[in-house]
């Protein structure tokens, strides 16, 4: 997260980290006791999922292995359209004040809405500084028309843009798959942006979750 600050303790109890061994790979969100939602470009063969603490490496955190993951069938490694994936935990997460399910959206929020993006990704770019504490930054949803002015034909209709004009506030490497939460509901998953991260007027691009709620629910049901 570029130009952000540590999240208020316990304010993101649905936030998870996907680890490869002990190394941060991506962010994600807890959908229910068995399922984590993240970005399709975060796919690995096996995951260790960190839940229940804002601090990576916290021994009080839950760590659950996951071996099965289901990319959206329409995901493209060229355009990165449909960049979302469900990861099935090998054992159930224990819900608590620090481990809660995210609220999936019932509607798409409009441009101008203030949202929070969070993650343990690098806070500097191109040199990297990985924080141990979960970082947050507020950004505003940007209309597809305005975002297309920047990204032209790279932007697909299930992609959502967010940023602050003339500001560095953005996501970065390591934040992928993590949540963009607006008015208490999950509206986006960190997908991509320009490099180095935090270039003013280059919005972050997110998978627009409100377009995929049916696929999310159907996939969890199918692979119960």
């Amino acid at each position: 997260i570029i130009d952000g600050a540590p999240c208020a303790r316990g304010s993101h109890p649905w936030q998870v980290a996907l680890l490869s061994g002990n190394q941060l790979h991506c962010g994600g969100v807890l959908v229910n006791e068995r399922w984590v939602l993240t970005a399709a470009h975060c796919k690995m063969n096996e995951y260790t999922v960190h839940l229940g603490s804002d601090t990576l490496g916290d021994r009080r955190a839950q760590r659950i292995k996951a071996s099965k993951s289901f990319r959206h069938p329409g995901y493209s490694t060229q355009t990165h359209v449909n960049d979302l994936m469900l990861v099935k935990l090998n054992s159930q997460a224990r819900l608590s004040s620090m481990v809660k399910k995210v609220r999936l959206p019932s509607r798409c929020e409009p441009p101008g809405t203030t949202c929070t993006v969070s993650g343990w990704g690098t806070t500097t770019s191109p040199d990297v500084t990985f924080p141990s504490d979960l970082m947050c930054v507020d950004v505003k949803l940007i209309s597809p028309q305005d975002c297309t002015k920047v990204y032209k034909d790279l932007l697909e209709n299930s992609m959502l843009c967010a940023g602050i004009p003339d500001s560095k506030k953005n996501a970065c490497n390591g934040d992928s798959g993590g949540p963009l939460v607006c008015r208490g509901t999950l509206q986006g998953l960190v997908s991509w942006g320009t490099f180095p991260c935090g270039q003013p007027n280059d919005p972050g691009v997110y998978t627009q979750v409100c377009k995929f709620t049916k696929w999310i629910n159907d996939t969890m049901k199918k692979h119960r």
Epitope: A39, H41, H80, L154, F195
Partner: antibody
Framework: QLQLQESGPGLVKPSETLSLTCTVS??????????WVWIRQPPGKGLEWIGS???????YYSPSLKSRVTISVDTSKNQFSLKLSSVTAADTAVYYC???????????????????WGQGTTVTVSS | DIQMTQSPSSLSASVGDRVTITCRAS??????LNWYQQKPGKAPKLLIY???SLQSGVPSRFSGSGSGTDFTLTISSLQPEDFATYYC??????????FGGGTKVEIK
């Protein structure tokens, strides 16, 4: 600004291992989120990608060379290196090291262009 | 593997000419294409990244366009220092990274 410099023997015997080092100055190989790349160019021919290594020390190799190539990083010396085993005359080329600048973050971090290059070092395979 | 085909392989042009070089990918590569200039005995130099973005310090007479499978490098008004070999390069999600065969721009 960032500079890259290749070093290693200019002459290698057939069946031996070619070893080259790229020294990075003006920047840190251990703290920058770039790819570090080896490319070669046989005499009078085009450019051929050999392989790359990223910030996380993940390696990516050309399928045609994969069985013979090892790329590694020595962060204490700010260097990365190339080893190519069982060389033949077909491995005679100018070898370049380069920095791969990602075209984006997240899903677009896997794509890159080489924005800084070493001047190249000529390696001849001959007995 | 994705093959990159450049055309023409060589061309002769005069100072001030508009020069166009094309690069075709064997399958769609979105906009993940870069262009390089190489002068004899020198390392390549990045000119254009992401199909159309001009690398810092490169003169504005160079431009790139295209997406999917067909890409173009244009030099709007050829200068004496532009006589060189030009390569396109695709940056894949899965290796290998591949270059086109090169286009040599010579003085007419």
């Amino acid at each position: 600004q960032l500079q890259l410099q290749e070093s290693g023997p200019g002459l290698v015997k057939p069946s031996e291992t070619l070893s080259l080092t790229c020294t990075v100055s003006g920047g840190s190989i251990s703290s920058d989120d770039y790819y570090w790349v080896w490319i070669r160019q046989p005499p009078g021919k085009g450019l051929e990608w050999i392989g790359s290594i990223d910030y996380y020390a993940s390696t990516y190799y050309s399928p045609s060379l994969k069985s013979r190539v090892t790329i590694s990083v020595d962060t204490s010396k700010n260097q990365f290196s190339l080893k190519l085993s069982s060389v033949t005359a077909a491995d005679t080329a100018v070898y370049y090291c380069a920095r791969g600048r990602p075209l984006g973050y997240g899903a677009k971090h896997y794509y890159y262009g080489m924005d800084v290059w070493g001047q190249g070092t000529t390696v001849t395979v001959s007995s | 593997d994705i093959q990159m085909t450049q055309s023409p392989s060589s061309l002769s042009a005069s100072v001030g000419d508009r020069v166009t070089i094309t690069c075709r990918a064997s399958q769609s590569i979105s906009s993940y294409l870069n262009w390089y200039q190489q002068k004899p005995g020198k390392a390549p130099k990045l000119l254009i990244y992401s199909a159309s973005s001009l690398q810092s310090g490169v003169p504005s007479r160079f431009s790139g366009s295209g997406s999917g499978t067909d890409f173009t490098l244009t030099i709007s008004s050829l200068q004496p220092e532009d006589f060189a070999t030009y390569y396109c390069q695709q940056s894949p999600y899965f290796p290998p990274l591949t270059f086109g065969g090169g286009t040599k721009v010579e003085i007419k």
